[in-house]
Amino acid sequence: SERCDDWGLDTMRQIQVFEDEPARIKCPLFEHFLKFNYSTAHSAGLTLIWYWTRQDRDLEEPINFRLPENRISKEKDVLWFRPTLLNDTGNYTCMLRNTTYCSKVAFPLEVVQKDSCFNSPMKLPVHKLYIEYGIQRITCPNVDGYFPSSVKPTITWYMGCYKIQNFNNVIPEGMNLSFLIALISNNGNYTCVVTYPENGRTFHLTRTLTVKVVGSPKNAVPPVIHSPNDHVVYEKEPGEELLIPCTVYFSFLMDSRNEVWWTIDGKKPDDITIDVTINESISHSRTEDETRTQILSIKKVTSEDLKRSYVCHARSAKGEVAKAAKVKQKVPAPRYTVELACGFGAT
């Protein structure tokens, strides 16, 4: 066949769907690769063709659209499973073509099984809620397009294995789940099960997401440098190892980049000639506040090094702060034996 623009296997779109549930999968060509949509392509006389490669096979084969009850069908740029089976797992290709043009992309589809408590290998999206921060809601994700607006589905919410009903603080509101005051105890996996009728059959959509309760923006502060501070003096003799920790607390801030860095005499350590190493460690609280520690280390410090200015800097979306470490050369203690001997006129 003639040349076809092949976008290869799009592993960025690792699609996972539950066994025995409907799935609608849009051809990724129009969403991520081409600059026109399906309607434009269709009206220009282009045809969308689907085929697949079964798991652990190399042979591409056409998709069987003549299964009983139209179990697999295509509608515009969407491939429908009503419902999926475990052996639908494989790599799927959609190809857009006419006599002069061809473009195609493949993507992996994995049909996964879940247990009665909704545990599965499915990768779960994470929804962050601010602690004690007004009423917040999560919405049952990825259910658009499965049924028309005239159909009124039933939605049941679960936390872990338990149906959410009559929880004081968490209230199912149809497609939404309301958290009146989010607390650490609300951390966990939440599942919505959407049940709807179609052509005399009943289908279920299961969607699970992880809720993580994080620090509230109303409690957020600029970075706080705990170390270095005014109470600790780094007093060293030449030849000793100099270790200065820079420990900074960052309030949780959604999408904030937290940064910590040292300057030595106003320059980044990379820009000066002394042999300095910096090691960083990061820890998080239960609400994802962050503590970063950067330890500045000079193995054998010189008297010149002990005269330099060592400043720890920190920055977040809330602001920037800096603190200088108090570094000084240790005054050597008098060597009494020699000095006393000299005092008595000994030679």
Epitope: G134, N166, N168, N169, I171, E173, L180, I181
Partner: antibody
Framework: QIQLVQSGPELKKPGETVKISCKAS????????MHWVKQSPGEGLKWMGW????????TYADDFKGRFGFSLETSASSAYLQINDLKNEDMATYFC?????????WGQGTTLTVSS | DIVLTQSPATLSVTPGDSVSLSCRAS??????LHWYQQKSHESPRLLIK???QSISGIPSRFSGSGSGTDFTLSINSVETEDFGVYFC?????????FGGGTKLEIK
């Protein structure tokens, strides 16, 4: 059937303290938040706050912080509203209301008269 | 705080008339709006939840519509027992707020 029964009308002097009770029956008390709503004579409804009947944690609207307190006696399926240092503007009818996304059941109201 | 404005303040109708009561929110509250009826010397009673969902035991002549900032409570063919004050209430965020009420009275 589900019922919220409040204590009877109260006549108090300014500076005194009043404690209004709300006894729930017909459902599991600790499964639903209990909210308090104030209705001054000839006026609308004002939300005062709520108490989480499972944890006992109270939340107060800004206008009701300080002199107002919500408490529970879980074993008696009862919620309480206490108002300290009563003022003339506290004269109103106070309702308890069960909450589950909205106020689906209300107490009959307790009328508080504050007069010297 | 979210402010709910109800209009009209008073509505005089004859039994058998159909009426619409309005509630406008100062910001979008999705469908997190509920309607209550309060008769003289009684506690409020939930009529409609989440803007348009009916409540069991409430006559079908009561219906609700709207989303975002504009909401309507409709009473199809008012009956004498319907006279009283109607309040809207939002549960979109703290603090919960009520509208000032619409008094439905006999003409």
């Amino acid at each position: 059937q589900i019922q919220l029964v409040q204590s009877g009308p109260e006549l108090k002097k300014p500076g005194e303290t009043v404690k209004i009770s709300c006894k729930a029956s017909g459902y599991t008390f600790t499964n639903y938040g209990m909210h308090w709503v104030k209705q001054s004579p000839g006026e609308g409804l004002k939300w005062m706050g709520w108490i989480n009947t499972y944890t006992g944690e109270p939340t107060y609207a800004d206008d009701f912080k300080g002199r107002f307190g919500f408490s529970l006696e879980t074993s008696a399926s009862s919620a309480y509203l206490q108002i300290n240092d009563l003022k003339n503007e506290d004269m109103a009818t106070y309702f308890c209301a069960r909450y589950y996304g909205n106020f689906d059941y209300w107490g009959q109201g307790t009328t508080l008269t504050v007069s010297s | 705080d979210i402010v709910l404005t109800q209009s009209p303040a008073t509505l005089s109708v004859t039994p058998g008339d159909s009426v619409s009561l309005s509630c406008r929110a100062s910001q979008s509250i999705s469908n997190n709006l509920h309607w209550y009826q309060q008769k003289s010397h009684e506690s409020p009673r939930l009529l409609i939840k989440y803007a348009s969902q009916s409540i069991s035991g409430i006559p079908s002549r009561f219906s609700g519509s709207g989303s975002g900032t504009d909401f309507t409570l409709s009473i199809n063919s008012v009956e004498t027992e319907d006279f009283g004050v109607y309040f809207c209430q939002q549960s979109h965020n703290w603090p919960h707020t009520f509208g000032g009420g619409t008094k439905l009275e006999i003409k």
